[in-house]
């Protein structure tokens, strides 16, 4: 995130409810911190289509968070 500035969230707005699994290149989870007080799920889309924030309350986001946490712990 080249433009990332301290003290602000990376996403604006509630985020998309779901992204087609076939379009996902990778998922990043940003946990609450000094920079942002909420969890953020950032999806990198395939074919250089940029990034999107997934609504952390959505079913898909919950599944991704669970998957990542299982992998990491």
């Amino acid at each position: 995130f080249p433009m990332f500035k301290r003290g602000r969230c990376l996403c604006i707005g509630p985020g998309v409810k779901a992204v087609k699994v076939a379009d996902i290149e990778k998922a990043s989870i940003m946990y609450p911190s000094n920079n942002c007080d909420k969890i953020e799920v950032i999806i990198t889309l395939k074919e250089n289509k940029g990034q999107r924030c997934l609504n952390p309350k959505s079913k898909q986001a919950r599944l991704i968070i669970k998957k990542v946490e299982r992998k990491n712990f």
């Epitope: 433009m3 604006i12 707005g13 509630p14 985020g15 409810k17 950032i42 289509k49 997934l54």
Partner: nanobody, 129 residues
Framework: EVQLVESGGGLVQAGGSLRLSCAAS????????IGWFRQAPGKEREGVSI????????YYADSVKGRFTISSDNAKNTVYLQMNSLKPEDTAVYYC??????????????????????WGQGTQVTVSS
């Protein structure tokens, strides 16, 4: 049917002001961030200012901070961009967009995605020196 209708563009002298309006319909306002983007001839479309109607959070490009103010009237499903101290380099077509999942870091070289974004037709802003 989703509609975003911009108004308020025009010709103004450097140092002057304009107020752009974006009237939205056909979707749930709170599910989207609403933003103003601009495209100058031969340049990429860039994010100018964005507001999330769900929590009121805002974003401003560095080039407009302190000069432009974004606000929304949720009852009217309308977003406003008050532009003060306009400069010739603000000359561009200004587009209103509604989007889901915008990542702030990507707003300077924005890639629209038809699945998640709706766009207005644009309004011309010309600032003469």
């Amino acid at each position: 049917e989703v509609q975003l209708v911009e108004s308020g563009g025009g010709l103004v002298q450097a140092g002057g002001s304009l107020r752009l309006s974006c009237a939205a319909s056909g979707f749930t306002f709170d599910d989207y961030a609403i933003g103003w983007f601009r495209q100058a001839p031969g340049k990429e479309r860039e994010g100018v200012s964005i507001i999330s109607s769900s929590d009121g959070s805002t974003y401003y490009a560095d080039s407009v901070k302190g000069r432009f103010t974004i606000s929304s009237d949720n009852a009217k499903n309308t977003v406003y961009l008050q532009m003060n101290s306009l400069k010739p380099e603000d000359t561009a077509v200004y587009y209103c967009a509604a989007g889901q999942g915008w990542v702030i870091a990507t707003m300077t070289s924005f890639r629209a995605h038809r699945e998640y974004d709706y766009w207005g037709q644009g309004t011309q802003v010309t600032v003469s020196s």
